[in-house]
Interface confidence: medium
């Protein structure tokens, strides 16, 4: 851990490791019963991860601040590096034990060593993210997260090269969400769908998260999204361009959608 190659590696946590990955309900965090969590993993060709599988993944950097179902009705989450808001300052599997009430609602930890990869953690100065299968249409029931973390002081210039997602009022069906942070909780920028290219977005800091979700019906052409690192500006011009440039875009959707 610590500072290496200009990157804070203690914050670079794996999105998927040793076949283990985190899943949440389409409707948001902590919405899955045990049966539903099991079904989510099985739908993707996997199964709920065991405690051992989750711990093995944690040991190679799998860190998620969200409690989820594991095999045999167990609930917990993997913490690589303790933080003030997650894991009670501890590392390891934060274990809520085997739940007597299988109707409790949590997220899910799935295990599938053969699952199609999408998303990940990116520290390169430039990269292009593509919807799974691009240039072919993406599939139903996809969830992908791309986490970007660049060198401290750099900012991220995000631009949309191709964009074609199913339309729905308020982008409730298929969408890309952008967050000006390293998670999908803070710094919400917007939700995007349709086939008009969203405007470029510039982060306020050195981190950004992209989330892609497709629902159970109707797909479209998909997307290519490029980011480029912007080197620190001189002190005299710092802070002048920290907002996104997306508010004029025709398919920019402001606000959270958790109430629907």
């Amino acid at each position: 851990w610590g500072f290496k190659d200009g990157i804070f590696h203690n914050s670079i946590w794996l999105e998927r490791a040793a076949g283990v990955y985190h899943r949440e309900a389409r409707s948001g965090k902590y919405k899955l019963t045990y049966a539903e969590a099991k079904a989510v993993c099985e739908f993707e060709g996997g199964h709920l991860a065991t405690y051992k599988q989750l711990e093995a993944a944690r040991k190679i950097g799998f860190h998620v601040c969200a409690a989820g179902w594991m095999a045999k009705g167990r609930v917990g989450y993997p913490i690589v590096k303790p933080g003030p808001n997650c894991g009670f300052g501890k590392t390891g599997i934060i274990d809520y034990g085997i739940r007597l009430n299988r109707s409790e609602r949590w997220d899910a930890y799935c295990y599938n060593p053969h699952a199609k990869e999408c998303g990940g953690v990116f520290t390169d100065p430039k990269q292009i993210f593509k919807s799974p299968g691009f240039p072919n249409e993406y599939e139903d029931n996809q969830i992908c997260y791309w986490h970007i973390r660049l060198k401290y002081g750099q900012r991220i210039h995000l631009s949309f090269l191709d964009f074609d997602l199913e339309d729905d009022p308020g982008c409730l069906a298929d969408y890309v969400e952008i967050y000006d942070s390293y998670d999908d909780v803070h710094g919400f920028v917007g939700r995007y769908c349709g086939d008009e290219l969203p405007d470029d977005i510039i982060s306020t800091g050195n981190v950004m998260t992209l989330k892609f979700l497709s629902d159970a019906s109707v797909t479209a052409g998909g997307f290519q999204i490029k980011y480029v690192a912007m080197d620190p500006v001189s002190k005299s011009s710092q802070g002048k361009n920290t907002s996104t440039t997306s508010t004029g875009n025709k398919n920019f959707l402001a606000g959270r959608f958790s109430h629907l």
């Epitope: 409730l172 109707v218 025709k250 398919n251 109430h259």
Partner: antibody, heavy 124, light 106 residues
Framework: EVKLVESGGGLVQPGGSLSLSCAAS????????MSWVRQPPGKALEWLGF??????????EYSASVKGRFTISRDNSQSILYLQMNALRAEDSATYYC???????????????WGTGTTVTVSS | QIVLTQSPAIMSASPGEKVTMTCSAS?????MHWYQQKSGTSPKRWIY???KLASGVPARFSGSGSGTSYSLTISSMEAEDAATYYC?????????FGSGTELEIK
């Protein structure tokens, strides 16, 4: 001519139920998302929910104020939209409109055709 | 949810007078739609996508704006324009309407 005509309104007691209908004509009903909007007397319009078209399996979305109490459904063979209202409250008193949703890319969604409206009064 | 505030709530104009009403959004929206409603009747689509006139709407009407500030303008008021006008957004769920501007003829 594209036309929407609501029916089923009336007086109902608090806690009661009521079902509203909206007969559609002049367009291919299955191709459109359909919505319900209400307007309390002398007040502004409020969106209640919508139901998607055939390609999306006729799934529905609701506003927070009616979710769990109101259900939108459709009979595509007869081109009728329904709003089933349960656990009615005094504040549900309003004129209820069905409206066709039109779009050509998000967020270009708007209500392009409105029904004539039917009045619901919730009072003891 | 995004709150749309319309002003003024009530206004009156003489025939031939220019009329402007505004709709302010609590957060930035991509487009604004406008509906006309006359007393005792259902709303009618009037202006969509901020500035496009619905079919049958006279050319004296226009719409403009961006971000959080939008407006509807009538270049020369006519008696038939007396109605309540509602703005509406669907840039974020749920879709919301403004409280309306009631336009009277003097």
């Amino acid at each position: 001519e594209v036309k929407l005509v609501e029916s089923g309104g009336g007086l109902v007691q608090p806690g009661g139920s009521l079902s509203l209908s909206c007969a559609a004509s002049g367009f291919t009903f299955t191709d459109y998302y359909m919505s319900w909007v209400r307007q309390p007397p002398g007040k502004a319009l409020e969106w209640l929910g919508f139901i998607r078209h055939k390609a999306k399996g006729y799934t529905a979305e609701y506003s927070a104020s009616v979710k769990g109490r109101f259900t939108i459904s459709r009979d595509n063979s007869q081109s009728i939209l329904y709003l089933q209202m349960n656990a009615l409250r005094a504040e549900d008193s309003a004129t209820y409109y069905c409206a066709r949703l039109y779009y050509y890319g998000s967020p270009h969604w708007y209500f392009d055709v409105w029904g004539t409206g039917t009045t619901v009064t919730v009072s003891s | 949810q995004i709150v749309l505030t319309q002003s003024p709530a009530i206004m009156s104009a003489s025939p031939g007078e220019k009329v402007t009403m505004t709709c302010s959004a609590s957060s930035s929206v991509s487009y604004m739609h406008w509906y006309q409603q006359k007393s005792g009747t259902s709303p009618k689509r009037w202006i969509y996508d901020t500035s496009k006139l619905a079919s049958g709407v006279p050319a004296r009407f226009s719409g403009s704006g961006s971000g959080t500030s939008y407006s509807l303008t009538i270049s020369s008021m006519e008696a038939e324009d007396a109605a309540t006008y509602y703005c509406q957004q669907w840039s974020s769920n749920p879709p919301t309407f403004g409280s309306g501007t009631e336009l009277e003829i003097k």
